[in-house]
């Protein structure tokens, strides 16, 4: 496993695929996390609660994901190797208020031939 | 005047400075617009209304700006010329509800010597 950053560990690599981790504060109860590659939304995961506190998880783009109480990890099997691409996470916080959206960590992922290596630039 | 894009006209140049235009829907009545350069918030403008409909404009970072009913333009006199930087606008919508934040147009601004020229890549 090679990590893009020992501090943030946004990118990690497994069997030719990449895991991209999007962290969020543990206080956040209801959220939407989106993973962008440049302007394209690759993955979107929404967690909400109803009035009876039942939890709904929506994954409309059918991404492989893992949700914990402070991060969403998306698993991409075929990262774009044609060029270095800029990936970043966008977090919409529904609960607790106030409603807000934060651009989270982002980084450039450079893939050379079949080797997965990562040049990471954290920005938010 | 040189425009980064004839369609969006996010960047335009005047006397060595750059005007960055952040568009928003005309239906938005109360908002916060932030201009980012990479991870750094350069400018922030908040327009709110009180219960008597009095308008409050907050400009805590003392940016030069122009506010219209569908855009906020920020004027930067000394854009960072050390390297190409990625600029984007972030819009928080307070009114009308639901509260939300949108990442608006973004682009790379490349400055070579004293010449201002722009390579723009729209992403949202």
């Amino acid at each position: 496993e090679i990590n893009g950053s020992a501090d943030h560990r946004m990118f990690s690599f497994h069997n030719g695929g990449v895991q991209i981790s999007c962290k969020y504060p543990e206080t956040v109860q209801q959220l939407k996390m989106r993973l962008f590659r440049e302007r394209e939304v690759l993955c979107e995961l929404t967690k909400t609660k109803g009035s009876g506190n039942a939890v709904s998880i929506k994954n409309p783009m059918l991404c492989l994901y893992h949700l914990s109480n402070n991060s969403v990890s998306f698993f991409l099997n075929n990262p774009d190797s044609s060029q270095g691409s800029y990936y970043f996470c966008s977090l919409s916080i529904f609960d607790p208020p106030p409603f807000q959206e934060r651009n989270l960590s982002g980084g450039y992922l450079h893939i050379y031939e079949s080797q997965l290596c990562c040049q990471l630039k954290l920005w938010l | 005047e040189i425009n980064g894009s004839a369609d969006h006209r996010m960047f335009s140049f005047h006397n060595g400075g750059v005007q960055i235009s952040c568009k928003y829907p005309e239906t938005v009545q109360q908002l916060k617009m932030r201009l980012f350069r990479e991870r750094e918030v350069l400018c922030e403008l908040t327009k709110t209304k009180g219960s008597g409909n009095a308008v409050s404009i907050k400009n805590p970072m003392l940016c030069l700006y122009h506010l219209s009913n569908n855009s906020v333009s920020f004027f930067l006199n000394n854009p960072d010329s050390s390297q190409g930087s990625y600029y984007f606008c972030s819009l928080s919508i307070f009114d009308p509800p639901p509260f939300q934040e949108r990442n608006l147009s973004g682009g790379y601004l490349h400055i070579y010597e004293s010449q201002l020229c722009c390579q723009l890549k729209l992403w949202l």
Partner: antibody, heavy 117, light 111 residues
Amino acid sequence: EVQLVESGGGLVKPGGSLKLSCAASGFTFSDYWMDWVRQAPGKGLEWVGNIDEDGSITEYSPFVKGRFTISRDNVKNILYLQMNSVKSEDTATYYCTRWGRFAFDSWGQGTLVTVSS
Amino acid sequence: DIVMTQSPSSLAVSPGDRVTINCKSSQSLLSGSFHYLTWYQQKTGQAPKLLIFYASTRHTGVPDRFMGSGSGTDFTLTINSFQTEDLGDYYCHHHYNAPPTFGPGTKLELR
């Protein structure tokens, strides 16, 4: 502006059925859980049930579970309440409400259902 | 199910009065750092309206004379300087678990 408009109320006999509708506008309907809350004449508020954003999760009050069904049409922006095997104690004004993540932040004007023979 | 109780059930008030309505839950409504307790106002012949959520946060547009407070199982809605347009019924409500339940309500009437 958020608007919720209920319809379909009226007189129904005990054991009968009725379907209420709630037309939503002014917001992205498919982004929100929606609920039904009722109020018997001269009484307080009582939660009936809810449905999540795409209709895959529903919850019901124990008083209506097995008799009432909540559904939604996210293309038409309509919330439904199918009431079967109604009882006299189901007589109430039925309100359609938007669950704004942590409260009922928008309510319809209500539609009156009267169960009587 | 969590049982919500309110006191008083009715209250005669005059303009300018400081009004206090109490709500008690049968178990704590604290989840994380928030209390899942909401207050609604209902005027005669109208649908309820959201006043306060998370026990103490005023909803958009609610006058600042309305204040919510409390923790654990005991909560209070205070109206500082009651106005005649505040007449109506007030309900507390929890969304800690299913089923969410309302208190029986408190009716404010003119003295």
